[in-house]
Amino acid sequence: TIQGTNRSSKGRSLIGKVDGTSHVTGKGVTVETVFSVDEFSASVLTGKLTTVFLPIVYTIVFVVGLPSNGMALWVFLFRTKKKHPAVIYMANLALADLLSVIWFPLKIAYHIHGNNWIYGEALCNVLIGFFYGNMYCSILFMTCLSVQRYWVIVNPMGHSRKKANIAIGISLAIWLLILLVTIPLYVVKQTIFIPALNITTCHDVLPEQLLVGDMFNYFLSLAIGVFLFPAFLTASAYVLMIRMLRSSAMDENSEKKRKRAIKLIVTVLAMYLICFTPSNLLLVVHYFLIKSQGQSHVYALYIVALCLSTLNSCIDPFVYYFVSHDFRDHAKNALLCRSVRTVKQMQVSLTSKKHSRKSSSYSSSSTTVKTSY
């Protein structure tokens, strides 16, 4: 968002007054409170960055993220017999992505129509709440998954019901925490009419009084508590994991696991570099500039960073791929347009010819393979 202010003050996640209503008079609209944006912000709001680039990225995220996370959630819930902690965290990660991505058609339409929100105040608040909620949920569940991966390597004990229950408890706590920290986004008025541009923005222009102090403090707190601290935990887990893998004996199976672990680490690192770090950094810088100077010179960068943060919904499936054997199987077969059941039946058929006694350990109706840990 940029700063605007309203004319009894002017308004961008710019600055303005919160009680703006309007009534039509002839050709134009008479506004009760004017939200006036600076020229740079207006050029961003009407330019190709927000009306072409953003909808393209969001369309890609929607087209990739919806089916892949949908399939992942389905696999983790219905096609994975043993609900290991990692499966639980990944299921929550997929759910968080889905809850954000399902609103993207509205977001795409908003940007294509020149950043003009026509779907009402409530939907705008839901969209924004879920947008930020997804980012912070992803960070926290990714942290849990990373710590859990390290824990499994250090402490390779079998699956226990207790561990699964702890993972469920942690997941519920994360959802509750995110719900609480995003309450301000649902409560604050997010839609603002900009008379100069004849558009109603959603979150892109926010009231001055709110932004100057509160938004900076809010996003700074989130950046420290829900980004930096989890990022430190994630990095620590992976550094320790790499050390453990380096020092361990290398048979063929261990080598495969090591390669997969490295791919996972690279994927999570990419996610932090592309999605989480730029957005959290620029959220703080952007609101700091508004607070101190009344306008943000990094507005365009901030917009791009927030846009890129949604790519986590496309990157998460790669995490599932490197962690879950089940998801790997379903993903491969989905791409090859064949069912896992068919593949399993082929495997069973081949196995029974060679080892008739061993074939009893595979049920042709089974669609699960042990998740790799």
Partner: antibody, heavy 119, light 106 residues
Amino acid sequence: QVQLQQWGAGLLKPSETLSLTCAVYGFSLNSYGVIWIRQPPGKGLEWIGVIWGNGNTYYNPSLKSRVTISVDTSKNQFSLKLSSVTAADTAVYYCARWRGYKDYPFDYWGQGTLVTVSS
Amino acid sequence: EIVLTQSPATLSLSPGERATLSCKASQNIYKYLDWYQQKPGQAPRLLIYNTNSLHTGIPARFSGSGSGRDFTLTISSLEPEDFAVYYCLQHNSGWTFGGGTKVEIK
């Protein structure tokens, strides 16, 4: 060359409606609007209302119930109407060009029209 | 509503002298302050916008400074045509004019 030219009735009786026109030259109404400002004799400046080129308006809350500002894009003209005038509305009325953005000033002004309200 | 207080109300100086006009806002208006010059019987004329940007065609002897709540218009060396009334205008939150400072010949 940017120019704003004003005209309208100079002498009004109380309760009548003040009507002024501001014709603009040298710039596009797509990009600019105007603000109306008044200055009572020997006093400071007070803004009355603003209109964007797209027709959207915003009025000073203290005058809102009596003010109407409109635009005729075909003639490149803006008009100000102030109803139920009293002696307190006696002032020089100015129109000034405004880009419509927060960081833009009122860079060019009309010559001003003295309106006197007297019974 | 933001209130702008200009001081002094009147400034008596001779041509060639330096004039310093002050404008104080009741709250933070960042850089969104303009200065206008008005001569008797004329419309105000924009001199400085956004605290320190000189409007087209305005002589370099005019300069603006400040930020937040305290702003200054400086005329480095007064010319005979500079004797007039000067108004500040804030446009951060609504529009408010200051009461004006009259610069007169001593």
